[in-house]
């Protein structure tokens, strides 16, 4: 049910990368507006983004108080400048999300290479610990924080002269790995959750090479 | 449920090309890794390469480099393996693999059934 | 590469024995090694994963434990079902090595 001059909304989406999380869907408003509400499975509604001709929601604020819990969330259409209008039932039009676990589906955002270091034949190299929009005690957390050794990152490297992509595993954000002398490797790390079912891997780092500037070597 | 399959083995001249398909059902190949692995007859296993199916990394054996290339198609959920040049000492059972991680630990849980590939003339 | 050693090559073993497989690796691997049964005609299947990690639906008869660069797969009894050759892999670094395998007959 609902007014005769209002479409419920559908395709309702979560859009999340590293919790940073938007709720979107359709169609384009004409002549109504939207209201989003969230909650987990056992809170209250908590009303977002009011009236808005908008077809997305910011909902990061909501779902990063706690990352473990599954949140559903669903959008009101209200026809526009009568917002106090509702439908036959007594409600106004409303379609809900799909539920949403930010731990378990957020996706694993593009990584970055902060520096690497050749000492010898050996090389370590470094992944910047992202900061997430999670806080705890009004500070904000590293995705290193939050998914602590449930994250992994995953090494690809190879010699600048070839192709084949030798693999390495760390579940800090630190690889050391034996590298022939002489030759120069290119680098680039992917994250993982291997304890996931969906969304396990992250878009691989840009590339890094040895004899660029983010790169040290040391002769020993 | 988890399987592959294997297919496109069969009795090749030397020199001569085939192509290996290994069909997953029950997972996505992207959010995994998969191994091909082989195993001349009555002798051991022997690691043939890797695709990392989700950016298309590969890496293969000394004795395999430059002559097999492996593949994955995702809308497919299909890896495959393409042998060229081939030798009579590529002749066995080729088995595809998937791969997982524990912590940063790997293992391969899922294996194919096997398909042989005779190079004979 | 690194190199795995498996002793012995073969063994004959009753049931109700208690049969032991070792792994030496020629270099540090951590615990990234793994161990696989495989019976005539048919694919390996995983038994033991991180060295110690027995494999969902494997018998709790199997264990697998490391020293430093040495690898153990333990049959605390041996079953007819457990005639087969046992291989271990380590995945430490790339390329993934296999040993020789281990071919587990009937006495």
């Known amino acids: 049910s609902g007014t005769t001059n209002t479409v419920a909304a559908y395709n309702l989406t979560w859009k999340s990368t590293n919790f940073k999380t938007i709720l979107e869907w359709e169609p384009k408003p004409v002549n109504q507006v939207y209201t989003v509400q969230i909650s987990t499975k056992s809170g209250d509604w908590k009303s977002k983004c009011f009236y808005t001709t908008d077809t997305e929601c910011d909902l990061t604020d909501e779902i990063v108080k706690d990352v473990k819990q599954t949140y559903l969330a669903r959008v009101f259409s209200y026809p526009a400048g009568n917002v106090e209008s509702t439908g036959s039932a007594g409600e106004p039009l409303y379609e809900n999300s799909p539920e949403f676990t930010p731990y378990l589906e957020t996706n694993l955002g593009q990584p970055t290479i902060q520096s690497f270091e050749q000492v010898g034949t050996k090389v370590n190299v470094t992944v910047e610990d992202e900061r997430t929009l999670v806080r705890r005690n009004n500070t904000f957390l590293s995705l290193r924080d939050v998914f602590g050794k449930d994250l992994i990152y995953t090494l690809y490297y190879w010699k600048s002269s070839s192709s084949g992509k030798k693999t390495a595993k760390t579940n800090t954000n630190e690889f050391l790995i034996d590298v022939d002398k002489g030759e120069n490797y290119c680098f680039s790390v992917q994250a993982v959750i291997p304890s996931r079912t969906v969304n396990r891997k992250s878009t691989d780092s840009p590339v890094e090479c040895m004899g660029q500037e983010k790169g040290e070597f040391r002769e020993i | 449920e988890v399987q592959l399959v294997e297919s496109g083995g069969g009795l090749v001249q030397p020199g001569g090309s085939l192509r290996l398909s290994c069909a997953a059902s029950?997972?996505?190949?992207?959010?995994?890794?998969i191994h091909w692995v082989r195993q001349a007859p009555g002798k051991g296993l022997e690691w043939v390469g890797y695709i990392d199916p989700y950016n298309g990394a590969t890496y293969y054996a000394d004795s395999v480099k430059g002559r097999f290339t492996i593949s994955a198609d995702t809308s497919k959920n299909a890896a495959y393996l393409q042998m060229n040049s081939l030798r009579a000492e590529d002749t066995a059972v080729y088995y595809c693999?998937?791969?997982?991680?524990?912590?940063?630990?790997?293992?391969?849980?899922?294996w194919g059934q096997g398909t042989l590939v005779t190079v004979s003339s | 590469d690194i190199q795995m050693t498996q002793s012995p090559s073969s063994l004959s073993a009753s049931v109700g024995d208690r049969v032991t497989i070792t792994c030496r690796a020629s270099?540090?691997?951590?615990?990234?090694v793994a161990w696989y049964q495989q019976k005539p005609g048919k694919a390996p299947k995983l038994l033991i994963y991180?060295?110690?990690f027995l494999y969902s639906g494997v018998p709790s008869r199997f264990s697998g434990s490391r020293s430093g660069t040495d690898f153990t797969l333990t049959i605390s009894s041996l079953q007819p079902e457990d005639f087969a050759t046992y291989y271990c892999?380590?995945?430490?670094?790339?390329?993934?090595?296999f040993g020789q395998g281990t071919k587990v007959e009937i006495k």
């Open positions: 029950g997972f996505t190949i992207s959010g995994y890794w």
């Open positions: 270099q540090d691997v951590n615990t990234a």
């Open positions: 693999a998937r791969a997982d991680y524990f912590y940063i630990d790997e293992y391969w849980d899922y």
């Open positions: 991180s060295a110690s």
């Open positions: 892999q380590q995945h430490y670094t790339t390329p993934p090595t």
